[in-house]
């Protein structure tokens, strides 16, 4: 029997290196069967995930997946960090893996850590 659970397809340990000043769309791929669930984005702050209430979002449909998109127009230096999308479905809360944005501020040319650095500093990924 085909699964009709809601699925959020953000890849585990996914990351995106982006430039401050550029536009960027962060995708939360959502699979559902009947009624589209209520989906939100939050930004991780320590162990809590702070809901992003007043940010521009939109839906995009393709094939059997919908994409709940968080818009950065433009990306700001303080957009650096880890994000998660969540879906409310039949009174259940389903949370995605976190996805990390590494924002390079063109002015300061600060670079995101290398994968080797991240391996030795796992709190960058698991916050």
């Amino acid at each position: 029997k085909e699964s009709c659970d809601v699925q959020l397809y953000i890849k585990r340990q996914s990351e995106h290196s982006i430039l401050a000043g550029d536009p960027f769309e962060l995708e939360c791929p959502v699979k559902y069967c009947a009624n589209r669930p209520h989906v939100t984005w939050c930004k991780l702050n320590g162990t809590t995930c702070v809901k992003l209430e007043d940010r521009q979002t939109s839906w995009k449909e393709e094939k059997n997946i919908s994409f709940f998109i968080l818009h950065f127009e433009p990306v700001l230096p303080n957009d650096n960090g880890s994000y998660r999308c969540s879906a409310n479905f039949q009174s259940n809360l389903i949370e995605s893996h976190s996805t990390t944005l590494y924002v390079t501020d063109v002015k300061s040319a600060s670079e995101r850590p290398s994968k080797d650095e991240m391996a030795s500093r796992p709190w960058l990924l698991y916050r």
Partner: antibody, heavy 116, light 106 residues
């Protein structure tokens, strides 16, 4: 309808760099993830790596030191470079769209032989 | 990386037979598993995703089940065009494929 087409030399000398390009039509590489997979003659499938819609990459740990995947959004192409090749890298190389839950669109594959 | 072990590596069957292929993951992957069909000289074709969801355009005789570490692909009534090699695939951080199961004509 999204279609993928691999291109590149079919013969590469040992110790040289294998370079392949995947051209995407009917869709944009600015969404989704885009993978390279290979299949040695008579063997199974091996994932090489992917590039995301933002340009971030993830590689098979066993190949990581030799692999680079990049994208050219203006041409709607993504590319594979595999350095220091040996006969063990002889395979059919496929590009595919990683539609989050699996690879739903594949190129037809291109055969690369490593031989002097 | 997570390893996938498929069994059997090959099987012989007749048209109309019910065929079952299993895939075992070296650690739990929830339902993050897909199944592909590959015919000689062709690219793989996605059949099943999320362990049990049928990809668009795939005949309903194909079905998938399982969660965690043990998964099954079933062909309810084998058709002539189903003779091929089948692969399972987990799409965790480092994706991997099973070794394949070749379905041959008895």
């Amino acid at each position: 309808q999204v279609q993928l087409q691999e291109s590149g030399p079919g013969l590469v000398k040992p110790s040289e760099t294998l370079s392949l390009t995947c051209t995407v039509s009917g869709g944009s590489i600015s969404s989704y993830y885009w993978s390279w997979i290979r299949q040695p003659p008579g063997k199974g499938l091996e994932w090489i790596g992917y590039i995301s819609y933002s340009g971030s990459t993830n590689y098979n740990p066993s190949l990581k030191s030799r692999v680079t995947i990049s994208a050219d959004t203006s041409k709607n192409q993504f590319s594979l470079k595999l350095s220091s090749v040996t006969a063990a890298d002889t395979a059919v190389y496929y590009c595919a769209r990683d539609f989050y839950y699996g690879m739903d669109v594949w190129g037809q594959g291109t055969t690369v032989t490593v031989s002097s | 990386a997570i390893q996938l072990t498929q069994s059997p590596s090959s099987l012989s069957a007749s048209v109309g037979d019910r065929v079952t292929i299993t895939c075992r993951a070296s650690q739990g992957i929830s339902s993050a598993l897909a199944w592909y069909q590959q015919k000689p000289g062709k690219a793989p074709k996605l059949l099943i995703y999320d362990a049990s969801s049928l990809e668009s355009g795939v005949p309903s005789r194909f079905s998938g089940s399982g969660s965690g570490t043990d998964f099954t692909l079933t062909i309810s009534s084998l058709q002539p065009e189903d003779f091929a090699t089948y692969y399972c695939h987990q799409f965790d951080y480092y994706p991997t494929f099973g070794g394949g199961t070749k379905v041959e004509i008895k």
